[in-house]
Interface confidence: low
């Protein structure tokens, strides 16, 4: 299953399959997730070790048993791969690291005004994998505002150094945010030239393209089909790159197929997994296990559930079958691809779906990290759980926010439905950033059921929480995925990095905003909050947030939307925007429904008919 816990001050002994430098444990975990054999990782922050060579060291590990002995090491962080973790699987990493220089091959330098602009330039450069930016307070004047675009053979820094007034980060191409755009075309009977960065065996050009997309240095590929004239080269997928970023030449060649990485696509990237099953094909590799199952789909499910399994062959040979069940060969290799592909067999083969991000498991998501008053524009995919609840009567308008917490569930505020209880007037838009992008052709979800908390009373602030069951489940993408619910009884004191988002008013007497706004707001103790609202009862089922001086807050139109906090690299839904005295007034914090206090209610209401919870909170 999916294991998300991190182990502080612990280091896994042995089992090393790869090592690299990463700026933090979350990035190390992502590299482990995408490594074909990595199940566990250990990370050494700069503060945990004196040996300069091992600082920022990320050690990827494998284990036949799925675990390794942990040894105490102050400052070290260890954890599990997120294979099998559904929508938590993403190569997107938005964080900016202050005071850190990520080293690599510097291939482009320019002057820019901010680290965000530098990251944007990296994202819009086909070869850039990561970058460093010297701030305007950097000690050497000639380097100030320099944006260095970088790459390395493995896609990770060749070294990471602590350096004041330098900020580093990664390209946002894996977040589907590149402005470059991509070539979806597959070119039949054409071979590309240039430098081969890797060679793997694949059953078709589409698997080859997906592998290219998620390979750090692949920009385009050539695939040799199973009828290619040279037998030893059949089914070979050559991953390629070039200085210019495009093939310098192409040659007409029978039984070859070429194409491009899809990493530069905007808004949609292929899933990092291969779901197709190939009849009459055997995949060779190291044997992990053999089991008798009924049907090729069950064989694929078995492979997916066994975390080390990478691909499988389901044999229909008479000697491999008994009654209705046949042998399911679960296999693996060093690079995650078959070591041999044979055609015209009595088997069917395919891949594990452990890296597919549509899995219906825990609603947690570790990815991102009333217009909001004092806020700033959000960017695509930054808050993928945010939805817009709109009402269509004569005209259509945005009324409230909400949070996606499962394929078919949205959590919002009960007061959004005051006077508008009819399900069919509501339209729910997910995966959007600009309200102006909504046209009559924009897909939306309709409501199957509105579940308002039984103790909520109109015009009272208590129990301001409601669940929406959607008519049809939503697929998860980089721009549309759920937020993790807190654990029951979570104390809010652990949360120091909290954000409120919404399209609401930018001032008390304002108007709905076009671009989704975000604002970083600190939590306020209930005691402090009660002092500010002496005419109201601030209960333990509420949480407050705001600045003493005001200036930043949720406002009309943000209601029902999320108050999310990032802790240990994971975003959690701490509150639901509920009420407040005006907007962003001095010493008048915003009041939010405390989600942790309603976990029993949420889980009870989201039970499906078969009694299985549709979502769960983190362990």
């Amino acid at each position: 299953g999916c294991l998300t816990q991190l182990y502080e001050n612990a280091f896994f002994r042995g089992g090393d399959v790869a090592s690299m430098y990463t700026p933090n444990a979350q990035y190390c975990q992502m590299r482990c997730t995408f490594h074909p054999r990595c199940l566990l990782f250990s990370f050494l922050p700069a503060s945990s070790i004196n040996d300069m060579e091992k600082r920022f060291g990320c050690f990827l590990k494998d284990s036949v048993t799925g675990t390794l002995p942990k040894v105490h090491r102050t400052g070290a962080v260890s954890g599990h791969s997120l294979k099998q973790c559904g929508h938590q699987i993403s190569a997107c990493h938005r964080d900016i690291y202050k005071g850190v220089d990520m080293r690599g091959v510097n291939f482009n330098v320019s002057k820019v005004s901010s680290v965000e602009e530098c990251q944007k330039r990296c994202t819009s450069n086909i070869r850039c994998q990561f970058f460093s930016y010297a701030t305007q307070t950097f000690h050497k004047a000639e380097y100030r505002n320099n944006c260095l675009l970088k790459y390395s053979p493995g896609g990770t820094p060749t070294a990471i150094k602590v350096l004041s007034n330098v900020e580093s980060g990664f390209s946002l191409k894996p977040c589907a945010l590149s402005e470059i755009g991509c070539h979806m075309n597959i070119f039949q009977h054409l071979a590309f030239s240039d430098v081969d960065v890797a060679r793997v065996l694949t059953p078709d050009a589409f698997v080859c393209r997906t592998i290219c997309t998620y390979h750090p240095n692949c920009l385009f590929f050539t695939f040799y089909t199973n009828v290619w004239k040279i037998e030893s080269q059949r089914n070979v997928c050559l991953l390629k790159t070039s200085e210019s970023g495009t093939p310098s030449s192409s040659t007409p060649q029978e039984n070859t197929i070429s194409g491009y990485s899809l990493l530069t696509c905007k808004r949609t990237l292929p899933e990092p997994c291969h779901s197709k099953i190939y009849p009459g094909v055997d995949f060779g590799g190291e044997e992990l296990n053999v089991t008798f199952v009924k049907g090729v789909n069950v064989c694929q499910e078995t492979c997916t559930k066994m975390i080390r399994c990478q691909f499988f062959t389901y044999s229909l040979l008479p000697e491999d079958c008994k009654e209705e069940k046949c042998k399911c060969f679960l296999r693996l290799s060093m690079d995650g691809s078959p070591t041999r592909i044979a055609y015209g067999t009595q088997g069917s083969s395919g891949y594990s779906l452990r890296l597919c991000n549509t899995g219906d498991n825990s609603v947690c998501t570790t990815k991102t990290s009333t217009r909001i008053v004092g806020g700033t524009n959000s960017s695509w995919g930054e808050w993928p759980w945010q939805v817009s609840l709109q009402v269509k009567l004569t005209a259509q308008r945005h009324l409230c926010g909400g949070s996606l917490i499962g394929h078919q569930w949205v959590l919002t505020a009960a007061h959004c439905f005051d006077g508008l209880p009819l399900q069919d007037v509501w339209r729910i838009y997910s995966g959007i950033l600009n309200l102006s992008d909504i046209t009559k052709d924009t897909p939306f979800s309709q409501i199957k059921e509105i579940i308002i908390h039984q103790n909520y009373k109109v015009s009272e602030g208590n129990h301001d929480i409601a669940l929406i069951k959607l008519q049809a489940p939503l697929n998860y993408t980089e721009f549309q995925k759920p937020i993790c619910l807190p654990s029951k009884g979570d104390t809010s004191t652990i949360y120091t990095n909290c954000w409120v988002t919404g399209w609401g008013f930018s001032k008390e007497k304002g108007e709905i905003q076009n671009i989704l706004q975000k604002v970083n707001i600190p939590l306020v103790t209930n005691e402090e909050c009660q002092k500010r609202y002496q005419d109201y009862k601030i209960t333990q089922r509420m949480v407050c947030a705001g600045y003493k001086e005001g200036g930043k807050d949720a406002c009309k139109g943000d209601s029902g939307g999320p108050l999310v906090c990032k802790h240990n690299g994971m975003w959690r839904l701490v509150g639901i925007t509920s009420w407040g005295e005006g907007c962003a007034r001095r010493e008048q914090p915003g009041v939010y429904t405390k989600v942790a206090e309603y976990m029993d209610w949420i889980l009870e209401k989201t039970q499906s008919s078969d009694g299985k919870a549709q979502m769960q909170s983190p362990a």
């Epitope: 002057k111 820019v112 005004s113 305007q136 307070t137 100030r144 007034n165």
Partner: antibody, heavy 117, light 107 residues
Amino acid sequence: QVQLVQSGAEVKKPGASVKVSCKASGYTFTDYEMHWVRQAPVQGLEWMGAIHPGSGGTAYNQKFKGRVTMTRDTSTSTVYMELSSLRSEDTAVYYCARPYGYPFAYWGQGTLVTVSS
Amino acid sequence: DIQMTQSPSSLSASVGERVTITCKASEDIYNRLAWYQQKPGKAPKLLLYGETGLEAGFHLRFSGSGSGTHYTLTISSLQPEDFATYYCQQYWSTPWTFGQGTKVEIK
């Protein structure tokens, strides 16, 4: 709310130095850079440089390099701009300004520095 | 340094008139442009910036447009309180630089 209060007007002789202060309130002083912009009758608005009160790091406009020094006192939430080797063309109103993002959203009231023999 | 050239340097207009001020950068500043309004004896006030538009406290009659090296500030219907000097400023690359200003006077 954010407030930037500057020291009073100064009259200086050519070759002397002037030190202008800017006291900040209404926000976390160490979180935001403080910039200095001057407005001379002839030259218009001119960016002089910036200091990050948290780190003490500075960035100066090359034009003033060697003549300008920016410092801060975190205990009083005050930044200082000292300009040396004054000449008559340095007669101007000197503003401290705090960005919100990059543009200057908050300005001090200005300090008139007159350089005259 | 990036030079910012504003035009006109001054203009006279009547209340209710539409006014356009242009600002030309010596190189592409990628929309990193701010407009300020300054009244006599006062500090400049941020009016518009970047791609996000209006600063709080200013009316929607002010709008900015442009890209690359050419930018404009438009006041759709001039009001008595709009008579002031307007400055553009680039914040694409240091040193930040300002236009020389456009004085909007009552006709």
